[in-house]
């Protein structure tokens, strides 16, 4: 009886769209790497669905993912990081869909942190600095950062600056005086690894000073 139910489940499952996407995070917890996968369709019924990765692993043939609500997750030291792995969605031991992926091409860096902005009165500029955990990593060390800033009242008018360092200077003359600005930063692998933008850092807010008239100037 249960056999018939399982076959029925399988037939139903084969009609669904099980497209999924994954990203890796290297050395995310000491020397441990992580791999996170999720279905593209948020309405997929994930009951009884499992994810498994096989190939390009150290000491083991395959690894099963843990399910955390609607995402599937592995944290391990066992990724070889050379060659392609096969990632499959399975139900009752049968693969529904699979993807061959090199984990070094789907890297999502950790979000930058400690973003701050310091105004230099003498230089009439703002020095933007932030930190990234990737400076200490063995693998994904080279990143491109995207610094985005906007005047708080301009909801969708973000200005973007791409840079490889963790320091940026914004000239006061290019910003509105006496205005509140929001600034944030994210990172993407830039060399040796490929992948996706990190999450945005927490936003930092700063106010530009009023324009001081020089002595002797008329109002």
């Amino acid at each position: 009886e249960s056999g018939y139910a399982q076959n029925g489940d399988l037939e139903d499952a084969e009609l669904d769209d099980y497209s999924f996407s994954c990203y890796s995070q290297l050395e995310v917890n000491g020397s441990q790497h992580s791999l996170t996968c999720a279905f593209e369709d948020p309405d997929v019924n994930t009951t009884n669905l499992e994810f498994e990765i096989c190939g390009a692993l150290v000491e083991v043939k395959c690894l099963s993912f843990r399910k955390l609500q609607e995402i599937y997750f592995i944290e391990t030291k066992k990724f070889l990081l050379i060659g392609k792995s096969n990632i499959c969605v399975k139900v009752g031991g049968k693969s529904l869909t699979c993807k061959k992926i090199d984990l070094t091409t789907i890297v999502k860096p950790e979000a930058p942190f400690d973003l701050s902005v310091i105004y230099r009165e003498g230089a009439n500029d703002f020095v933007v600095t932030f930190n990234t955990s990737h400076l200490q990593k063995k693998y994904v060390k080279v990143l491109m950062h995207d610094v985005a800033y906007r005047q708080e009242k301009d909801e969708n008018k973000w200005m973007h600056v791409n840079l490889s360092s963790t320091k940026l200077t914004l000239l006061q003359r290019n910003l509105q005086p006496e205005a509140m600005y929001e600034i944030k930063v994210r990172s993407i692998p830039d060399h040796y690894f490929k992948g996706f933008w990190s999450e945005w850092s927490p936003s930092y807010y700063f106010r530009t000073p009023e324009i001081n008239n020089s002595p002797g100037e008329m109002d």
């Epitope: 096989c54 190939g55 390009a56 043939k61 990081l81 050379i82 060659g83 392609k84 792995s85 096969n86 061959k100 090199d102 070094t104 091409t105 693998y139 060399h191 040796y192 690894f193």
Partner: nanobody
Framework: DVQLVESGGGLVQAGGSLRLSCESS????????MGWFRQAPGKELEFLAA????????HYSDSVKGRFTISRDNAKNTVYLQMNSLRAEDTGRYYC???????????WGQGTQVTVSS
């Protein structure tokens, strides 16, 4: 039709060095993992070293770690194996392989002979 061609083998004295090259004509070279293997007379094929598509990640067998270095030049479609402090037991035919796909190397060269005399 030949897709992987090894070169650089030869006769060398113990303690000496050799640099093997493997040129690929496979269109996906710059996104493929590459590996080096050897087969000593009367022995099984032995994995030596592998390198990821960009060169950032390498992996070595314990038998060659610290003596051999794998590298690649994606502009030249070539992978190298620098072999230092060679020993008599390093004698064998050296093969390169391309595209490590779910634990199977998809393409293999014909090999180049390395002989280390003591």
């Amino acid at each position: 039709d030949v897709q992987l061609v090894e070169s650089g083998g030869g006769l060398v004295q113990a303690g000496g060095s050799l640099r093997l090259s493997c040129e690929s004509s496979i269109s996906t070279f710059s996104s493929d993992a590459m590996g080096w293997f050897r087969q000593a007379p009367g022995k099984e094929l032995e994995f030596l070293a592998a390198i990821g598509w960009s060169g950032a990640v390498t992996h070595y067998s314990d038998s060659v770690k610290g003596r051999f270095t794998i590298s690649r030049d994606n502009a030249k479609n070539t992978v190298y194996l620098q072999m230092n402090s060679l020993r008599a037991e390093d004698t064998g035919r050296y093969y390169c392989a391309e595209d490590y796909d779910t634990d199977v190397w998809q393409y293999w060269g014909q090999g180049t002979q390395v002989t280390v005399s003591s």
